[in-house]
Interface confidence: medium
């Protein structure tokens, strides 16, 4: 019997210091460019190697960014969100939603043990 895939949604405050190449990630989404069906939120599409976000390590591709320096990212056009990040300053506080995939065992199997059975 196959296990089912569940998702665990968690939120985290991530403080980044802008580097030479900016914050070090790309975004997708916005009211004019929905990345997720029926969700106009802003999502991380790519973490740039050796950038500020990659060096910090907490931000992941696929994370949803809820706010920047306390400003809500709801109801934003994509370019407006880009501008908000560009003008966010040197020290940037991000409120981020992680969606973690959790692989559960078969129904009825809740104990620890050797996965080979």
């Amino acid at each position: 019997m196959n296990g089912r895939v569940d998702y665990l949604v968690t939120e985290e405050e991530i403080n980044l210091t802008r580097g030479p190449s900016g914050l070090g990630f790309n975004i997708v989404g916005g009211t004019d460019q929905q990345y997720v069906s029926n969700d106009s939120g802003i999502y991380v599409s790519r973490i740039k190697e050796n950038g500020a976000a990659a060096l910090d390590g907490r931000l992941q591709e696929g994370d949803k960014i809820l706010s920047v320096n306390g400003q809500d990212l709801k109801n934003l056009l994509h370019q407006d969100a880009v501008d908000l990040f560009r003008n966010a300053g040197y020290a940037v506080s991000l409120r981020v939603q992680h969606r973690l995939q959790v692989q559960n065992g078969p129904i009825g199997h809740r104990g620890e043990g050797d996965p080979s059975g």
Epitope: T31, D32, N75, L77, D83, L84
Partner: nanobody
Framework: QVQLVESGGGLVQAGGSLRLSCAVS??????MGWFRQAPGKEREFVAA????????VYADAVKGRVTISRDNAKNTVYLEMNSLKPEDTAVYYC????????????????????WGQGTQVTVS
């Protein structure tokens, strides 16, 4: 997509009051304005409010009788109109500035990129 929906218009007697509302979706951090167009006349500026809500501008014709405000949590802009006159009769339009987080409030139609369908105000 961007949508602006006005409501609150209607028929009112001279000296009366109305409160117009504009529900905004698809865009944020924009200066917002109210304009009006009377039959046979050009669309004209009435009032505008900054994206943060801390600054307002009014047309001379409505100063002291009209108040513009916004509730960013509800994505709604309001136009409170008092001491209405027959010459206030027009279709009132809500509009969003084309510029993101613009520093100064514009009164020119050309600065406003997004428009609602309008709500009719008739003062008898």
């Amino acid at each position: 997509q961007v949508q602006l929906v006005e409501s609150g218009g209607g028929l009112v007697q001279a000296g009366g009051s109305l409160r117009l509302s504009c529900a905004v979706s698809g865009v944020s951090f924009r200066n917002m304005g109210w304009f009006r167009q009377a039959p046979g006349k050009e669309r004209e500026f009435v009032a505008a409010i900054s994206w943060s809500g801390d600054s307002t501008v009014y047309a001379d014709a409505v100063k002291g009788r009209v108040t513009i405000s916004r509730d960013n949590a509800k994505n709604t802009v309001y136009l409170e109109m008092n001491s209405l006159k027959p010459e206030d009769t027009a279709v009132y339009y809500c509009a969003a500035d084309g510029r993101f987080r613009a520093g100064e409030i514009g009164t020119s139609l050309g600065l406003y990129r997004y428009w609602g369908q309008g709500t009719q105000v008739t003062v008898s």
